[in-house]
Interface confidence: medium
């Protein structure tokens, strides 16, 4: 089965610095997304060999790519505190496959010593299963997708 190897698991960087996230697969992709999952899910980039990459407006001008869609390194520049979060590679194949995630901790320079990554990779439980019913995504992706909130969460 297709897998996505993602590195690093976690990185701590000061405001204004850059970070590299690498997404590697065994090939056979249509393309790859980098997504930020959480309370406000966000597609960061979509990359496909031979196609102009699509970048979220929040990151426009701050993203570089190297490699190919099978072994892609995404560099995010001029990081801001608000960029802190877990970034997950998603390979688009016949079924959608997710990487393990990269936790990016952006810190004020003087406080960098207080916020350190542990050696452990992000736990799968950070990305709970999706809902059941007609909205169920591909079963192969189920363990990697967060729950959509109930309608009662509407403002």
């Amino acid at each position: 089965a297709q897998e996505v190897q993602q590195s690093p698991h976690c990185t701590t960087v000061p405001v204004g610095a850059s970070v590299n996230i690498t997404c590697s697969t065994s090939g056979g992709l249509r393309g790859i997304y980098l997504r930020q999952l959480g309370p406000q899910p966000q597609d960061i980039i979509y990359y496909e060999d031979g196609v102009v990459p699509t970048t979220d407006r929040r990151f426009r001008g701050r993203i570089d790519f190297s490699g190919s869609q099978d072994n892609l390194t995404i560099t995010m520049h001029r990081l801001q505190l608000s960029d802190t979060g877990t970034y997950t590679c998603q390979a688009i194949t016949e079924v959608n496959v997710y990487g393990s995630g990269t936790l990016v901790l952006v810190t004020e320079e003087q406080s960098q010593g207080w916020h350190r990554c542990s050696d452990a990779p992000p736990r799968a439980s950070a990305l709970p299963a999706p809902p059941t019913g007609s909205a169920l995504p591909d079963p192969q992706t189920a363990s990697a997708l967060p729950d959509p909130p109930a309608a009662s969460a509407l403002p």
């Epitope: 406000q40 899910p41 966000q42 699509t54 929040r58 688009i92 007609s134 967060p146 959509p148 309608a151």
Partner: nanobody, 122 residues
Amino acid sequence: QVQLQESGGGLVQPGGSLRLSCTASGLTLGYYAIGWFRQAPGKEREFVSTISASGGMTYYADSVKGRFTISRDNAKNTVYLEMNSLKPEDTAVYYCAAEYLGNLRHFRGDHWGKGTQVTVSS
């Protein structure tokens, strides 16, 4: 009960403009990519545009690029399709669809609206 309701269709002259709305109920729109599709009489349903859950990424069919603009207001649970420089070949029923954490370029659509008719004719 998830529902998507399209509105804003109608009859417009060539070169005119329309703004379609897609209002969602029964889901929190901020977790869903939204797509617009259209189906002309006797033709297959075709892709028009998609927008990411956050609204920061958009994707368009070549046939509408530069004329149509997709946008969203998650606070109002509504997605818009602004259509300018309309042509007779844009005549179709326009549908919106929602997909949980969906992909812009590989959009399937978990939930679909019933459509709104757009007719471009002089």
